[in-house]
Amino acid sequence: CKAMHVAQPAVVLASSRGIASFVCEYASPGKATEVRVTVLRQADSQVTEVCAATYMMGNELTFLDDSICTGTSSGNQVNLTIQGLRAMDTGLYICKVELMYPPPYYLGIGNGTQIYVIDPEPCPDSDF
């Protein structure tokens, strides 16, 4: 197993609709054909998996149907979008990239993107 550099933004603010997007870029040392991308969340001294997708270079990322993540790939960049976020989901979101094939196996872990989520204020009642 070999290490690989992964870059991601330090901070992202989710939209009022609870959507956050960020780019995860990895420095591929070779010509990988199969890549696995995992988004992890670190909060309260625990790391949990948010979503994961394996894709063939040149093809689209495919997350599970019930995943809160979507994404696209372009070269060594992955554009990730996480939906359905609420204030309680604020935390450090880490991009983990694995070059699965061909060997050797490479593992890269980003420094994390702090995603801030602010729940929208409910609209006040109107007389109209």
Epitope: A3, Q42, Q46, V47, I94, G110, N111
Partner: nanobody
Framework: EVQLVESGGGLVQPGGSLRLSCAAS????????IGWFRQAPGKEREEVSC????????NYADSVKGRFTVSRDNSKNTVILQMNSLRAEDTGVYYC???????????????????WGQGTQVTVSS
């Protein structure tokens, strides 16, 4: 809240083997840096081994190099310390310790640890 629990200690003859396990209750050890320490009677506590959050890095005290092996079993949420060719001087209480570092340090061992287990006794004697 995560708590660390060691198991696998016991009495073994010189040259024998033991397999210590460090498990987490109340959470997981995923990406935690885990260290193994021991304290022999009348001596200071010393770090024996550690494994990084990714499992890519392991460190060993000179006194156990080539005899002890630390590894992660993420499927069972445990960290294993395999101890072979045990000697009388390996006798002591073995403690599992852990710390969740920033992701930039997941490939490193921690310099200090937040959590400590209760310890498990290892006695090497004929």
């Amino acid at each position: 809240e995560v708590q660390l629990v060691e198991s696998g200690g016991g009495l073994v003859q010189p040259g024998g083997s033991l397999r210590l396990s460090c498990a987490a209750s109340g959470g997981t050890l995923d990406y935690w840096s885990i260290g193994w320490f021991r304290q022999a009677p009348g001596k200071e506590r010393e770090e024996v081994s550690c494994i990084s959050g990714t499992g890519l890095r392991t460190n060993y005290a000179d006194s156990v190099k080539g005899r002890f092996t630390v590894s992660r079993d993420n499927s069972k949420n445990t960290v294993i310390l395999q101890m072979n060719s045990l000697r009388a001087e390996d006798t002591g209480v073995y403690y599992c310790t852990g710390k969740l570092l920033h992701p930039s340090l997941w490939s490193a061992c921690a310099n200090e640890y937040d959590l400590w287990g209760q310890g498990t006794q290892v006695t090497v004697s004929s």
